[in-house]
């Protein structure tokens, strides 16, 4: 039970975190006009992965895609790869650990088989939140190398840009959004690694021991975790693991009041 | 047609204060920042501040500050301005000018003269 | 606060000619964001209230006559009027509509010569 919640929470919590990743990338909110000096401003800019922002005093916003690829910061498209393939990780995690799912019954998929891929998606998320942490801190890193620079902005020479009075830009909403993600996407895989021992014996310690319960014999095999029999015998069977015993629910297609949380 | 009507003519004492209104149709009244511009007789024109219809939110130049209050009534599509604590060089026209792209002023009322006798 | 300086105060010009009237702000009006010049351009005549011509320095009001363009950049900017026709008598004005508090310059006085 305990390895199911364990996983499920780690699924949960990997799911806001990927969400919470994509909303980041797709924010425009990365770093913000610094409005130390001035808290009022009638004219206010911020700037995204993919664009940037101009919103007045008048209420209206105007937004410009940075159309040029060539042209753009190195630093700035290296971001947007690690968020790019830490979203399409973390989706695949996604698609994988629903598979995984000891709550959810797939044909006769085993429980080595749900192991695995509860690993697999783990290790995908914690690269994926890792992914999220690195390109989010690398933006933060050329805000704050380019916040007393009196060059422009920080995307001076995009687009052929005039030379101007620096408009100097903090961090943004988006960047915390991201470092927040990023952070529950890392624990919620840390979480799925954890459910993963928890469902898959230890092959070496594992013991061949057979049962008998009445009319019918029930025995486990080495490597194998389903009851020889294709009977649903209410028979709790005990699987042993470094020498210390649990009792778990007998492996059947039918379900029981512990398949789903 | 966009229109911005204020308010008539007003005569007041020193030290009283006076709410100009200036009620906008023809256009959504919470979807454009209302300006408020001072002109005083054979002078040029100067800005008082601002205020956004749809939150509430204001902007005051430093001058005005603590004497003037820029409030709406969004059910009645109407913006006011009081100016508070009234001094003879207070006379002047006051116009309500809506805010377009560019923070441009694109639509005026007529304008609303406050006499303030020294 | 941007200081607006207008010249000259007043101009007086013939009916055909072209007028040109020149504005300066103590800080620069470009915004780096969207590269545009936050700076307006009204036109008033005598008992009434003021009109939009210009806004973010060159771009032309909707109904406004073409002969009126606007020029320039960062500080230094220039209103035209390439044929002077008799309506266009008035006091002309700019404004800093960047940075709060937005302020106006004094006025250029057009007159017919």
């Known amino acids: 039970m305990a390895v199911t919640a364990c996983q499920g929470l780690g699924f949960v919590v990997s799911l806001i975190g990927i969400a919470g990743i994509i909303a980041a990338t797709c924010m425009d909110q990365w770093s913000t006009q610094d409005l130390y000096n001035n808290p009022v401003t009638a004219v206010f800019n911020y700037q995204g992965l993919w664009r940037s922002c101009v919103r007045e005093s008048s209420g209206f916003t105007e937004c410009r895609g940075y159309f040029t690829l060539l042209g753009l910061p190195a630093m700035l498209q290296a971001v947007r790869a690690l968020m790019i393939v830490g979203i399409v990780l973390g989706a695949i995690g996604l698609l994988v650990s629903i598979f995984a799912l000891k709550c959810i019954r797939i044909g006769s998929m085993e429980d080595s088989a749900k192991a695995n891929m509860t690993l697999t998606s783990g290790i995908m998320f914690i690269v994926s939140g890792l992914c999220a942490i690195a390109g989010v801190s690398v933006f933060a890193n050329m805000l704050v190398t380019n916040f007393w620079m009196s060059t422009a902005n920080m995307y001076t020479g995009m687009g052929g840009m005039v030379q101007t009075v620096q408009t100097r830009y903090t961090f943004g909403a988006a960047l915390f959004v991201g470092w927040v993600a990023g952070g529950l996407t890392l624990i919620g895989g840390v979480m799925m690694c954890i459910a993963c021992r928890g469902l898959a014996p230890e092959e070496t310690n594992y013991k061949a021991v057979s049962y008998h319960a009445s009319g019918h014999s029930v025995a486990y095999k080495p490597g194998g975790f389903k009851a020889s029999t294709g009977f649903g015998s209410n028979t709790k069977n005990k699987k042993i693991y470094d020498g210390g015993a649990r009792t778990e629910d007998e492996v059947q297609s039918y379900p029981s009041k512990h398949d789903y949380v | 047609e966009v229109q911005l009507q204020q308010s008539g003519a007003e005569v007041k004492k020193p030290g009283a204060s006076v709410k100009v209104s200036c009620k906008a149709s023809g256009y959504s009244f919470t979807g454009y920042t209302m300006n408020w511009v001072k002109q005083a007789p054979g002078q040029g024109l100067e800005w008082i501040g601002l205020?956004?219809?749809?939150?509430?939110?204001?902007s005051y130049a430093q001058k005005f500050q603590g004497r003037v209050t820029m409030t709406r009534d969004t059910s009645i599509s109407t913006a006011y301005m009081e100016l508070s604590r009234l001094r003879s060089d207070d006379t002047a026209v006051y116009y309500c000018a809506r805010m377009n792209y560019g923070n441009a002023m694109d639509y005026w009322g007529a304008g609303t003269t406050v006499t303030v006798p020294s | 606060d941007i200081v607006m300086t207008q010249s000259p105060d007043s101009l007086a010009v013939s009916l055909g000619e072209r007028a040109t009237i020149n504005c300066k702000s103590s800080q620069s009006l470009l915004n780096s964001g969207n590269q545009k010049n936050y700076l307006t351009w009204y036109q008033q005549k005598p008992g009434q209230p003021p009109k939009l011509l210009i806004y973010?320095?060159?771009t032309r009001e909707s109904g406004v006559p073409d002969r009126f363009s606007g020029s320039g950049s960062g500080t230094d900017f220039t209103l035209t009027i390439s044929s002077l026709q008799a309506e266009d008598v008035a006091v002309y004005y700019c404004?800093?509509?960047?940075?709060?508090?937005?302020?106006f310059g004094a006025g250029t006085k057009l007159e017919l010569k």
């Open positions: 205020i956004n219809p749809y939150n509430g939110g204001t």
């Open positions: 404004q800093n509509d960047y940075s709060y508090p937005l302020t």
């Open positions: 973010w320095a060159s």
